[in-house]
Every structure is written in C-alpha cells, then in structure tokens.
C-alpha cells in the first residue's frame, strides 16, 4: 500500500502550529531585511 503524504505523519499535526509560527517569523525577518535593503538603495 502507498505511504501516506507527510501531512498524515503525526509529527505534522503536533508541530503544525509551531512550524507555521516559525515560518511566519522567517517571512517577517525576510520582509524586514528587504525593507532595509530598499532603504539603503
């Protein structure tokens, strides 16, 4: 039988919130860096 996609791994369920938060934090940092770069330019 075919293996389930990663969303069926229990880990995905238990870490979903923290991984989403980490990703949002990463995107915010990226946006901040981009703004700083634009200011310099």
């Amino acid at each position: 039988s075919e293996e389930p996609p990663i969303s069926l791994d229990l880990t995905f369920h238990l870490l979903r919130e923290v991984l989403e938060m980490a990703r949002a934090e990463q995107l915010a940092q990226q946006a901040h860096s981009n703004r700083k770069l634009m200011e310099i330019i």
Partner: antibody, heavy 118, light 112 residues
C-alpha cells in the same frame, strides 16, 4: 521494510563539530519527518529536534538551538545532524528516528557514538 | 518543560511474574486536540529504543499482548503481565503533547 542506517562512531576534540548521517530506505523519504534523539552514557533519552524532508521545515529543542543544524539530501534519502562547539557533555549515542501517523518514534537508526575528548 | 518522573528506578522481577512501571507528568499532557500523546519505549542493552505503546494504551504492531498501558491526565502505568527474559532492559515513558517533547528517566527491569 523501514531501515535507518547511521554513520560510524566519531571521536572529536572539544570545540570541534561533528556531522552524523542517517540513510533511510524502505519508504518514501519525503513522507515522514526525521527526528534526532541523543543518549549520554548510562543516561536517559533527550529529543534534539525534527526536520521535514519535504519542505525543509526544522524545529529544534531550545536547549540545542544555535549549536545544532539538521539538513537532508533528498537525492540520497539521507538526513544529517551537525553539532558544533562540542564539549565533553556531548559524548553520547545519537539516534535518528521516524514516526508514523500514530506515534512519534516508531523506527530508529542503530545509533552513532560520538565521543568528545581532549 | 514537562518533567516525566518514572518510578521505580529499578524493578527486580521474577520471570513469569507481573511487573508495573509508573510514569507521572509534571502537568497534564492532554493535548489541545483532546488526545494524550503518551508513549512507552523499551531499550534492551546495546540496542536502540523500541516503541511499545502509543497514545497511552495502544500497542504498536508486533508488540506482545502481555504489554499494556493505562492512565490519564498526569498518571500513567505500563504493565507486563508475565515477564519473559527478553523483556529485561530499560523502559521509558515519553510525552509528545507539549514542546519540547520529553522522556522519563527510565526504569530498569532486571532479574530479582
């Protein structure tokens, strides 16, 4: 069948880094998170972190943040755990492990002994 | 961090007799989804841990039915109905309900 085969034992000096590998087979590598757990000699188990081989999402136990780096190579179905600024307390057996839809550590590698000694 | 406390530290047993290991969490480990992610692992000397029980009372595939798990909230128990020689080793409880995930200190099951 699911198999996780780890790299061999390492001896390192304090302050150095070590990189342990974990080659997965018997399943689709990108379908399951990979975790790392360590066990100091005669001690209990300590969860270090987890990586999503599909998207590269990583979540580290705060205790190891800044010293541990987890990566994957999808082309070879291999996960890596690098620990830097080694100290004697890092002497331990390091395990990779995979879960299922029901449990977090259903399959384990054989372990890699890392000895930190001057 | 959720501290998982196991008792006893060592459990001397007679083969064929029952054994019981207790695990207490420092706070409730009921997850926000109403499940309790309490697992039990067996580690024989020189081997990696092996999953026995997940979500408090469910036996993993291939685990003999002499192993059973029970409990709720903060108090959990692993029972071996009749200890066999291959059951000797260290048993760990583990909680996956709260980050960071944490293991108990272990209970050594040995021959009396």
């Amino acid at each position: 069948q699911v198999q996780l085969v780890q790299s061999g034992a390492e001896v390192k000096k304090p302050g150095a880094s070590v990189k342990v590998s974990c080659k997965a087979s018997g399943y689709t590598f990108t379908d399951y998170f990979m975790k790392w757990v360590r066990q100091a000699p005669g001690q209990g188990l300590e969860w270090m972190g987890v990586i999503n081989p599909n998207q590269g999402d990583i979540f580290y136990n705060q205790k190891f943040k800044g010293r541990v780096t987890m990566t994957v190579d999808k082309s070879t179905s291999t996960a890596y755990m690098e620990l830097s600024s080694l100290r004697s307390e890092d002497t331990a057996v390091y395990y990779c492990a995979r879960g299922t839809d029901r449990a977090l550590f259903a399959y384990w590698g054989q372990g890699t002994l890392v000895t930190v000694s001057s | 961090d959720v501290v998982m406390t196991q008792t006893p530290l060592s459990s001397p047993v007679t083969l064929g007799q029952p054994a019981s290991i207790s695990c207490r969490s420092g706070q409730s480990i009921v997850h926000s989804d109403a499940n309790t992610y309490l697992e039990w692992y067996q580690q024989r000397p020189g081997q990696p841990p092996r999953l026995l029980i997940y979500k408090v009372s469910n036996r993993f595939s291939g685990v003999p039915d002499r192993f059973s798990g029970s409990g709720a909230g903060t108090d959990f128990t692993l029972k071996i109905s009749r200890v066999e020689a291959e059951d000797l080793g260290v048993y760990y409880c583990f909680q996956g309900s709260h980050i960071p995930w944490t293991f108990g200190g272990g209970t050594k099951v040995e021959i009396k």
